[in-house]
């Protein structure tokens, strides 16, 4: 792992100047785990749609990694497995929560943040502009 | 509305044994506004594998309004408009962090926690298991 | 149904403050934002400042940065604005807009103002 | 901060008319764009958000297009209730900002 050194200009989490802060506590609790196991899937490649998934790494965040889908045609792949290009393949976005360390490399004070993702690919029909 | 009492037992903020705790900056920063301008899609009704958007509330998380999709359909729509059973339509999942109340109605005090959403549907190529 | 209730007119001196409430119905008011809008006489909307109730932070238009407070008390779904050093150029209609506050999810996120109150007519003059 | 510009500033129409109100941003801004009606002495009211999207009890006739920096509000076969005041409001960044208002009256 990257070793990250401690920000001397660290925050002191009783610092009652600290902006808008609270308390967090990261010992993630999964919801996932009884009711949904998360099977590896293999949609990315089985799709008419299908996607590569591009590791997106930054030690400052959390999560650090986030994988991100990029459609890999810009069309769709027809049942005999070539592209028709008379569909389009287009990603589906989701706005995500993180935490940045804030100030960075700071190990105890974090700040939120919205990020936009790819999460995967989906076959459209197009939208045909006509020219009048 | 609901009228949410606030929790007497809600842990200090300077509490040293809140477990794995850290500080953290709630004036949520937007980094998609700079790069990426969010443009909104009816790809959920334009998509071979369509889906319908549920709304899932909780009060007690953040963000406490997510939108869940249901894939409509088991097949997927094909050149002609109806139903194609030799593909599958399955959601897209993603595993998410939100922050919840911990204890409940406690306005300072969190536990982060991830859960899996369907963002959207894919279309795919079912997996068939030949009988020997 | 949601309804966003507003406190009376108020009449103030230059230099004084004023508090307008703001108090919801219907909804789970933690889930949603409040922001403040303002219209003068025969002008158009102008944006103040709004909050994020759950975690009961605020933003605010740099004009009104340092002026204005805007606070919310989950325990009787009301939220507040606070001006203070007002002159005759704050006499105004002040609103409460309810904002969804929802994450973008390819199709929209809800950040527009669904609900408004029926506004606080705020005069000031000595 | 984003400058919203609409025209016409005002516009005087005949009732079962076609209204069109552009609404134009200083600066992309997706479709974080909405549409509000204000009426004399009341509160303004969601007509479409994201540039495109219908309220539930807003009349089908009002519809909204655009994404970036154009955008534009159709009223399709005006009616006499639709006299008022129309602003376009973008959310894309902080501070929210909306159009100067355009003022829409029946002949």
């Known amino acids: 792992g990257i070793t990250i050194p401690r920000n001397p200009g660290c925050p002191n989490s009783e610092d009652k100047n600290f902006p808008r802060t609270v308390m967090v506590n990261l010992n993630i609790h999964n919801r996932n785990t009884n009711t949904n196991p998360k099977r590896s899937s293999d949609y990315y490649n089985r799709s008419t749609s299908p996607w590569n998934l591009h590791r997106n790494e930054d030690p400052e965040r959390y999560p650090s990694v986030i994988w991100e889908a990029k459609c890999r045609h810009l069309g769709c792949i027809n049942a005999d497995g070539n592209v028709d290009y008379h569909m389009n393949s287009v990603p589906i976005q989701q706005e995500i929560l993180v935490l940045r360390r804030e100030p960075p490399h700071c190990p105890n004070s974090f700040r939120l943040e919205k990020i936009l993702v790819s999460v995967g690919c989906t076959c459209v029909t197009p939208i045909v502009h006509h020219v009048a | 509305g609901i009228t949410i009492p606030r929790n007497p037992g809600c842990p200090n903020s300077e509490d040293k044994n809140f477990p794995r705790t850290v500080m953290v900056n709630l004036n949520i920063h937007n980094r998609n506004t700079n790069t990426n301008p969010k443009r909104s899609s009816d790809y959920y009704n334009r998509s071979t594998s369509p889906w319908n958007l549920h709304r899932n509330e909780d009060p007690e998380r953040y963000p406490s309004v997510i939108w869940e999709a249901k894939c409509r359909h088991l097949g997927c729509i094909n050149a002609d408009g109806n139903v194609d059973y030799h593909m599958n339509s399955v959601p897209i999942q993603q595993e998410i962090l939100v922050l919840r109340r911990e204890p409940p109605h406690c306005p300072n005090s969190f536990r982060l926690e991830k859960i899996l959403v369907s963002v959207g549907c894919t279309c795919v190529t079912p997996i068939v298991h030949h009988v020997a | 149904e949601v309804q966003l209730v507003q406190s009376g007119a108020e009449v103030k001196k230059p230099g004084e403050s004023v508090k307008i409430s703001c108090k919801a119905s219907?909804?789970?008011?933690?889930?949603?934002?409040i922001s403040w809008v303002r219209q003068a006489p025969g002008q158009g909307l102008e944006w103040m400042g709004g909050i994020t109730v759950f975690f009961g932070t605020a933003d605010y238009a740099q004009k009104f940065q340092g002026r204005v407070t805007i606070t919310a008390d989950e325990s009787t779904t009301t939220a507040y604005m606070e001006l203070s050093g007002l002159t005759s150029d704050d006499t105004a209609v002040y609103y409460c807009a309810r904002v969804p506050n929802e994450f973008w999810n390819g199709y929209y996120a809800t950040q527009d103002f669904d609900y408004w109150g029926q506004g606080t007519t705020v005069t000031v003059s000595s | 901060e984003i400058v919203l510009t609409q025209s016409p500033d005002f516009q005087s129409v005949t009732p079962k008319e076609k209204v069109t109100i552009t609404c134009r941003a200083s600066q992309d801004i997706g479709s974080e764009l909405h549409w509000y009606q204000q009426k004399p002495d009341q509160s303004p009211k969601l007509l479409i958000k994201?540039?495109?999207h219908s309220i539930s009890g807003v009349p089908s006739r009002f519809s909204g297009s655009g994404s970036g920096t154009d955008f534009t509000l159709t009223i399709n076969s005006l009616e006499a209730e639709d006299a008022g005041t129309y602003y376009c409001h973008q959310s894309y960044w902080l501070p929210n900002t909306f159009g100067q208002g355009t003022k829409v009256d029946i002949k």
């Open positions: 994201y540039a495109s």
């Open positions: 219907g909804g789970s008011f933690s889930s949603y934002g």
